[in-house]
Amino acid sequence: QERRFQLEGPESLTVQEGLCVLVPCRLPTTLPASYYGYGYWFLEGADVPVATNDPDEEVQEETRGRFHLLWDPRRKNCSLSIRDARRRDNAAYFFRLKSKWMKYGYTSSKLSVRVMALTHRPNISIPGTLESGHPSNLTCSVPWVCEQGTPPIFSWMSAAPTSLGPRTTQSSVLTITPRPQDHSTNLTCQVTFPGAGVTMERTIQLNVSYAPQKVAISIFQGNSAAFKILQNTSSLPVLEGQALRLLCDADGNPPAHLSWFQGFPALNATPISNTGVLELPQVGSAEEGDFTCRAQHPLGSLQISLSLFVHWKPEGRAGGV
């Protein structure tokens, strides 16, 4: 003989794969205080329970260790705790109260559990700026994970030199020592929920601050093709009266400030151009000598020089006859 009672709350609950959900259940108020029995949660249509407090009863292999009956008859609590939710848990469940000493039991109404795809993704937090050569701690966190679930596995992937910092159930710390070449590369934190076999990842692009490593000058001479110098050049022959365009470029992040100087400048010298471009419309004696491009950056500066040697046109040097 069965007595029916209604589960309080919604008729269905939604949980994301790998996470936890509590199916609320309160024992019927009509239950006599003297009623002594065991509680069983069943999957609709099954005769082996998914969770019970009966030590003599087997539970389903699929739910063992993940489904727990939170049994507290004094507080009328018969709730079902589900952790590491799996797609296969998507079903209707009901609670049954049975007693070996009483001639009747209690059966609850059904409640549907809907298991959805995991849409949450890990968060990656970076404190301040990443600076080349300086260790920084990045944290990958999954604050939406429930404490009672199987701890997730954190996995990191970075091209930069790294080492592992501390971890908790909900987060993992990575110490990264980025290099200039790691700027704009991707870093991935992946989180796997082994209890449910679900994997999520988040990928971010690293923004690494670094001083200029390379500075170069491209030289545009008249209509001839440009050529590039990558190191200090002792002497570059130029024809008198020729137009010359010197283009300086450097790496560095954020971009270095480029400026041109005549000669070898002191630190506080005044530039002849405040950009990376130096236009010499007509090369003459005033332009003979050294020109320096300086790439200035908060993390360090770099400069490159070239020396112009002016070839005079024969008629330009001849006196009047």
Epitope: S158, M200, T203
Partner: antibody, heavy 120, light 107 residues
């Protein structure tokens, strides 16, 4: 038993293409960063490519960047390496390798290898 | 890129001897170093990671040590199954690079 089995190797002309596969079994494939490492005829080991567990992140050395593409199909537990614009220096025994699970770039499981020969 | 220089290139030894293989990195790799063993016709197998930790199932006669740029692998009381080629590999950022290998041959 954890296993990695490569296939798809063969003889190809310079400039040609080839796609290698690696079938994984015995472990949770999607949890791991996977890589390709090759061994030259001179027995030197060279890292070729790596891919994150979910496939959103890939890395290559300069020697193959722009020519090789690593990918994975987690539903099939399979890793791939698409090689194009092949050169004679790509001739090698190609291994599929599993990276340690958390962060460090060493390889705790290696496949048996598949041979790629680039020759005219 | 970090260069890994392994020495010696080859070594002729007898069973029962103790051997040491060294690996030098072109810059500090902060113990981010692995050692692999490769037997003839087989795939490499992880022996040591993070300079000194033995991989699962590796006999205790193997030992890794070192720091900074200098690392070594020591094999005490060499057994017949230890013959083969040994490689070091740094994992202090990419690109990952390997040493050229040290071939252990039976004297």
């Amino acid at each position: 038993e954890v296993m990695l089995v490569e296939s798809g190797g063969g003889l190809v002309k310079p400039g040609g293409s080839l796609k290698l596969s690696c079938a994984a079994s015995g472990f949770s494939f999607s949890t791991y960063v996977m890589s390709w490492v090759r061994q030259t005829p001179e027995k030197r080991l060279e890292w070729v490519a790596s891919i994150s567990g979910g496939g959103s992140n890939t890395y290559y050395p300069d020697s193959v960047k722009g020519r090789f593409t690593i990918s994975r199909d987690n539903a099939k537990n399979t890793l791939y390496l698409q090689m194009s614009s092949l050169r004679s220096e790509d001739t090698a025994l190609y291994y599929c390798a599993r990276r340690e699970v958390v962060v460090y770039w060493y390889f705790d499981v290696w496949g048996t290898g598949t041979t790629v020969t680039v020759s005219s | 890129d970090i260069q890994m220089t392994q020495s010696p290139a080859s070594l002729s030894v007898s069973v029962g001897e103790t051997v040491t293989i060294t690996c030098r990195a072109s810059e500090n790799i902060y113990s981010n170093l692995a050692w692999y063993q490769q037997k003839q016709g087989k795939s490499p197998q992880l022996l040591v990671f993070s300079a000194k930790n033995l991989a699962d199932g590796v006999p205790s006669r193997f030992g890794g040590s070192g720091s900074g740029t200098q690392y070594s692998l020591k094999i005490n009381s060499l057994q017949s199954e230890d013959f083969g080629t040994y490689y070091c590999q740094h994992f202090w950022g990419t690109p990952l690079t390997f040493g050229a290998g040290t071939k252990l041959e039976l004297k």
